[in-house]
């Protein structure tokens, strides 16, 4: 054991910015740290062979497999991989160790496998063995977070069941309204499972991995708040976990909270109660409502009532399903040129939703708001002022929803022009679509006044520039206009854009352009 | 250099959860498939593994005290964190946690690099 | 779970003496078996891994035999810095176990 070379693998993964196959070299590319894989002489097996820790990588990564050597003079190589013998260049680090490396770039199902690397070095020859496989990202789940009381503690445990396992944390926030937005310096996260401080205005628990982020709010309703004008309503779907808070604060202790369902007092079991004096010496008193697993007959009014405070209720509805409610009829807008303008969807949806906005293949982010009325709402302001079809997609795990827009901007036309041996055609792009006129001009009419009626021929393309039509006139040449300058002209109620075109034999055409408001 | 370094209280009151942290460097638990373990050590007593993490998230506990562990990993922190309820003298220890690669030809070398231990105290 | 016995609990012998730890699985757990040393107020070391496999940097004096529930640490002659615990652990199933060590004391 003595005899043999101290060898260390190690896996270097890349910031994917290149795409050549998987290649030996000796200089990998920036990366970061190596990890180590724990190479070890593989037991039983004939000869020496070192094996390092399977490794599991995403499709397209970019990794470098890597040995490092201890044993004293020059070493060879070759690099195996499924039958083929790859080239290998080993080189010497500052501690004078061999280093062998393997650099696979944008990884493919055809570069996983087995990676076997020979060396020989002057004391004695063996092997050293890497698994790589692509790691199966379609077993990967996000789920929104739920809450659970810690057992023999008043204090909550938020659980989300996702892979790979998600970090946890608390959103905690002891503002109202805007300054609770999530990076408001209001607002405090803390990285952990359980939550003792539950007297807080607003609180989140949300849980993230490879996926993204899932958060769940604390239902809460606040005897010392006006109540909304409409009920606040809770969705929780069969076989979920229901938790509300009811939070009141008074001057003394002499007061006490109760729930109640549909004018029934909860069961005990399915409340426990926490009090705190504040700093101004007021004592807080907050009474927690759950239930472990929600069934249909769990639907109903849920009251909070205080002895000092005006009671306050939430309408909790039980569904066996997931929904999205909002209308889909598509809506068209058109806007000016530099009017502000955004697209909006107001729905109401269990569970959350996860949407996005799509224009021209393009996906952008969505980000939603609860109004007061349990509604969402989803705006969209970043179009640019590009006219065409706007796409909202929406879908959470039981129903999907798509909603279109179509955005017209209101702009004069622009005209392009184009000449062959046998017509003229011109092509605008304003909005309103436009209307065309073709004018000859001659000695009779040198102002181009001399309309053209005969062989023209209209249309509305039907390919779209970035979603917006495109339309077309063509004029078909006679022996009465070929030789003379033809204007045609694009009319739509912001103005007039003409492009002047002389009727010779085929080739490049002068083409000028007049632009007549 | 593969180091795993454990922290946390070093005394706590019975009925507490213990919260003990593995910080790790030199390896991650991203692409390896390596996992990682927490034992303890009573004061003069045997070694007495608690818990296991797998790279891909799967879990394993001590039967005897299954009901009060809970098990999890930060990958972008490297780090493991095991929680222990409602803690008891009993529970004072040493707390190791420890390495375990897994090699794809269906063999470990079970624990073969671990951190220093954390003395950890119950006491009112 | 699987239980390991390790036997004996302490031993006593001198530098140059051949030494013989055994450890008994409760159940066949093939070679999936680890020794490990461990030093006052210090961290286990891995010796031997998969039953007989020496531990990179470990002195050849250690060796490890044995397959399906009886396991054998040998150390053929002692030297000053081998007086410490020695535990077994088998990684065959979870929960993992531990043997309960063998002090090896000088006499």
């Known amino acids: 054991n003595q005899d043999l070379p101290v060898i260390k693998c190690v896996l270097i993964n890349h910031k994917n910015n290149d795409s050549s196959v998987g290649k030996s070299s000796s200089y990998p590319m920036v990366s970061e740290s190596p990890e180590d894989l724990g190479c070890a002489l593989r037991p039983q097996s004939s000869g020496t062979v070192y094996e390092a820790a399977a490794v599991e990588v995403d499709v397209s990564a970019s990794i470098t497999l890597q040995v490092l050597v201890d044993a004293p003079g020059n070493i060879s190589c070759l690099w195996v991989f499924k039958h083929s013998s790859l080239n290998c260049q080993p080189h010497f680090d500052l501690q004078n160790r061999g280093v062998v490396s393997m650099v696979i770039l944008k990884m493919t199902e055809t570069q996983a496998g087995e990676y076997l690397l020979f060396i020989q070095s002057e004391a004695t020859n063996y092997t050293i063995l890497f698994t790589v496989s692509i790691r199966n990202t379609l077993l990967y789940t996000l789920r929104r977070p739920y809450f659970r009381k810690m057992e023999n503690q008043d204090a909550l445990v938020c659980i989300s069941e996702s892979v790979p396992e998600p970090i946890v944390e608390w959103v905690l926030c002891d503002s109202q309204g805007e300054s609770c937005k999530e990076e408001s310096p209001a607002v405090v996260k803390k990285e952990e499972k359980v939550l003792h401080e539950l007297f807080g205005t607003d609180i989140r628990c949300c849980a993230r991995n490879e996926l993204g982020r899932e958060c769940t709010r604390l239902f809460t309703i606040d005897l010392n708040q006006t109540p909304q004008t409409t009920l606040p309503q809770l969705f929780l779907k069969v076989g979920e976990p229901l938790w509300i808070r009811c939070k009141a604060v008074h001057v003394n202790h002499g007061f006490g909270l109760t729930w109640e369902l549909e004018n029934k007092a909860l069961e005990e079991g399915n409340y426990f109660e926490m009090s705190t004096y504040s700093t101004n010496r007021t004592m807080i008193r907050i009474l927690f409502a759950f239930v472990s697993s929600v069934a249909r007959n769990d639907t109903g009014y849920y009251t909070c009532s205080s002895s000092k405070h005006p009671s306050q209720s939430a309408l909790v509805t039980i569904v066996e399903k997931g929904f999205i409610n909002a209308t889909n009829s598509s809506e068209d807008y058109e806007i000016d040129q530099y009017e502000e303008f955004c697209f909006s969807v107001r729905f109401k949806a269990y569970p959350q939703i996860r949407c996005t906005w799509t224009f021209s293949r393009k996906s952008f982010p969505c980000e939603q708001k609860g109004l007061d009325n349990g509604y969402s709402i989803s705006k969209f302001c970043n179009h640019k002022h590009q006219p065409g079809e706007y796409i909202f997609h929406a879908e959470n795990d039981d129903a999907q929803f798509t909603k279109m827009f179509t955005l017209n901007i209101r702009r004069k036309p622009q005209v392009l022009a184009e000449a062959s041996a046998s017509q003229a055609s011109c092509f605008s792009d304003g909005y309103p679509l436009p209307s065309w006129t073709w004018k000859k001009c001659s000695d009779k009419s040198p102002n181009c006044t001399e309309e053209i009626t005969e062989g023209v021929w209209n249309r509305k393309a039907n390919r779209k520039v970035f979603g917006q039509w495109v339309s077309s006139s063509t004029l078909n040449m006679s022996e009465a206009i070929k030789g003379f300058l033809v204007k045609c002209c694009a009319y739509n109620s912001l103005g007039t854009s003409c492009e002047t075109i002389l009727l010779n034999s085929p080739g490049p055409f002068p083409f000028i352009q007049d632009n007549i408001s | 250099q593969v180091t795993l370094k454990e922290s946390g209280p070093t005394l706590v009151k019975p009925t507490e959860t213990l919260t003990l942290t593995c910080t790790f460097s030199?390896?991650?638990?991203?692409?390896?498939?390596?996992?990682v373990s927490w034992i303890r050590q009573p004061p003069g007593k045997c070694l007495e593994w608690l818990a296991h993490i797998f790279s891909n998230d799967e879990k394993s506990y001590s039967t005897s005290l299954k009901s009060r562990l809970t098990i999890s990993k930060d990958t972008s922190k490297s780090q493991v964190v095991l929680t222990l309820t409602n803690m008891d003298p009993v529970d004072t220890a040493t707390y190791f946690c420890?390495?375990?690669?897994?090699?794809?030809?269906?063999?470990?070398?079970?624990?073969?690099?671990w951190g220093q231990g954390t003395m950890v105290t119950v006491s009112s | 779970d699987i239980q390991m016995t390790q036997s004996p609990s302490s031993l006593s012998a001198s530098v140059g003496d051949r030494v013989t730890i055994t450890c008994r699985a409760s159940q066949d757990i093939r070679n999936d078996l680890a020794w490990y040393q461990q030093k006052p107020g210090k961290a286990p070391k891995r010796l031997i891994y998969a039953a007989s496999s020496l531990q990179s940097g470990v002195p050849s004096r250690f060796s490890g035999s044995g397959s399906g529930t009886e396991f054998t640490l040998t150390i053929s002659s002692l030297q000053p810095e081998d007086f410490a615990t020695y535990y077994c652990l088998q990684h065959n199933s979870y929960p993992l176990t531990f043997g309960c060590g063998t002090k090896l004391e000088i006499k």
């Open positions: 030199g390896f991650s638990l991203r692409y390896a498939r390596m996992g």
């Open positions: 420890a390495r375990m690669p897994e090699y794809s030809s269906g063999w470990s070398g079970a624990f073969d690099i």
